[in-house]
Amino acid sequence: STTKCTVSHEVADCSHLKLTQVPDDLPTNITVLNLTHNQLRRLPAANFTRYSQLTSLDVGFNTISKLEPELCQKLPMLKVLNLQHNELSQLSDKTFAFCTNLTELHLMSNSIQKIKNNPFVKQKNLITLDLSHNGLSSTKLGTQVQLENLQELLLSNNKIQALKSEELDIFANSSLKKLELSSNQIKEFSPGCFHAIGRLFGLFLNNVQLGPSLTEKLCLELANT
């Protein structure tokens, strides 16, 4: 192999190698590929054709600004996709449309300021969605009920100012257990905001300046679930 990746037990570690493109000489039977801390700007779908057995792909800490929807067409078994610390700013309906088997999607520390339309609507198996450390101003992730198997929604360190029932009720059929909202500037809990997610096990609000009246409002809304 010309690439200095380490391969062991179907796991390829290609991290910290200053790679500018996906290696094309790794064993075709790898199931885990770590490409973190490189200089990747794109993930051409064609480059993953030979790695169709991947169940986990970690491309964190690169400079990826756009994803080709065809990527997941080449990776039909992919369960974990980690894109943390990249330069993604927009997600479209097509971005993850073929990533139907994902159980974990990590998008923390990108530049996503708004979720438009329904980019996660095909993720029927998703358990963990991490959108922390972005620029999101609301919890709106879609326009229809979806993400029926989601258990963890991580939204800490964003710019969320209000929790609204019309944004959170897309989770009406989901089994959301953990909602992480720490380090946001929450100033409002609108009536019925927790109605659709009443089975929450943990609501995390560390470093959120609640104050007495907002705390009372929060308790009232939680009591009404």
């Epitope: 309906d93 097509k94 229809q144 009920v145 009720d169 009406a172 019925g192």
Partner: antibody
Framework: QVQLQQSGPGLVKPSQTLSLTCAIS??????????WGWIRQSPGRGLEWLGI?????????NYAVSVKSRITINPDTSKNQFSLQLNSVTPEDTAVYYC????????????WGQGTLVTVSS | QSVLTQPPSVSVAPGQTARISCSGD??????VHWYQQKPGQAPVLVIY???ERPSGIPERFSGSNSGNTATLTISGTQAEDEADYYC??????????FGGGTKLTVL
């Protein structure tokens, strides 16, 4: 097989309210897998989207900017239908009005009503 | 996706291939649907989600979408395909944006 049956007057006077109803069979207006809306087509013109309603834990609507101040779309769950109300009509609102079912997840219209020609004239 | 632009008319000889374009800024990032409308009738969905064909729609209808242009292709065009064709997409909060429509004439 889903069917949409429209009803309502074909003639409305200027400044009055246009009211149409769309009765649904083969599906539920409260479905979690579809949305419902209205489109119109002025004589010799293209299709113009007017608005949509969809149910999550509550009902939500979205209206076209061009009619936003005048339009209301309401569900009637007891009769499994939905309605269109367009206030303060003018002759420019003369058109064939269609009700429609939008299929999730990407809002293609897979079923249309038969269309109702509404003329606005005194 | 606020504006979708279609050619007003397209002509094709019977048996030939007709292509109807629908252009819009970065339309390739959105799903496009195509509707066929014959005079005096309600529209009919012929292609959804760029390239999917509803049951009952002939195989000669196909679609593609990338960059700034979506295309409806009718291979081996038949006289019965003469109609108006509309492209459509959605972009919250405008749940439907239609193109201006293209009149397909089968010569």
């Amino acid at each position: 097989q889903v069917q949409l049956q429209q009803s309502g007057p074909g003639l409305v006077k200027p400044s009055q309210t246009l009211s149409l109803t769309c009765a649904i069979s083969g599906d539920s207006v409260s479905s979690n897998s579809a949305a419902w809306g209205w489109i119109r087509q002025s004589p010799g013109r293209g299709l113009e989207w007017l608005g949509i309603i969809q149910k999550r834990s509550k009902w939500y609507n979205n209206y076209a900017v061009s009619v936003k101040s005048r339009i209301t779309i309401n569900p009637d769950t007891s009769k499994n239908q939905f309605s269109l109300q367009l206030n303060s009509v003018t002759p420019e609102d003369t058109a064939v009005y269609y009700c429609a079912r939008y299929s999730y997840p990407f809002y293609s219209i897979d079923y249309w009503g038969q269309g109702t020609l509404v003329t606005v004239s005194s | 996706q606020s504006v979708l632009t279609q050619p007003p008319s397209v002509s094709v000889a019977p048996g030939q291939t007709a292509r109807i374009s629908c252009s819009g800024d970065n339309i390739g990032s959105y799903y496009v649907h195509w509707y066929q409308q014959k005079p005096g009738q309600a529209p009919v969905l012929v292609i959804y989600e760029d390239s999917e064909r509803p049951s009952g729609i002939p195989e000669r209808f196909s679609g593609s979408n990338s960059g700034n242009t979506a295309t409806l292709t009718i291979s081996g065009t038949q006289a019965e395909d003469e109609a108006d064709y509309y492209c459509s997409s959605y972009d919250d909060p405008n749940f439907q944006v239609f193109g201006g429509g293209t009149k397909l004439t089968v010569l």
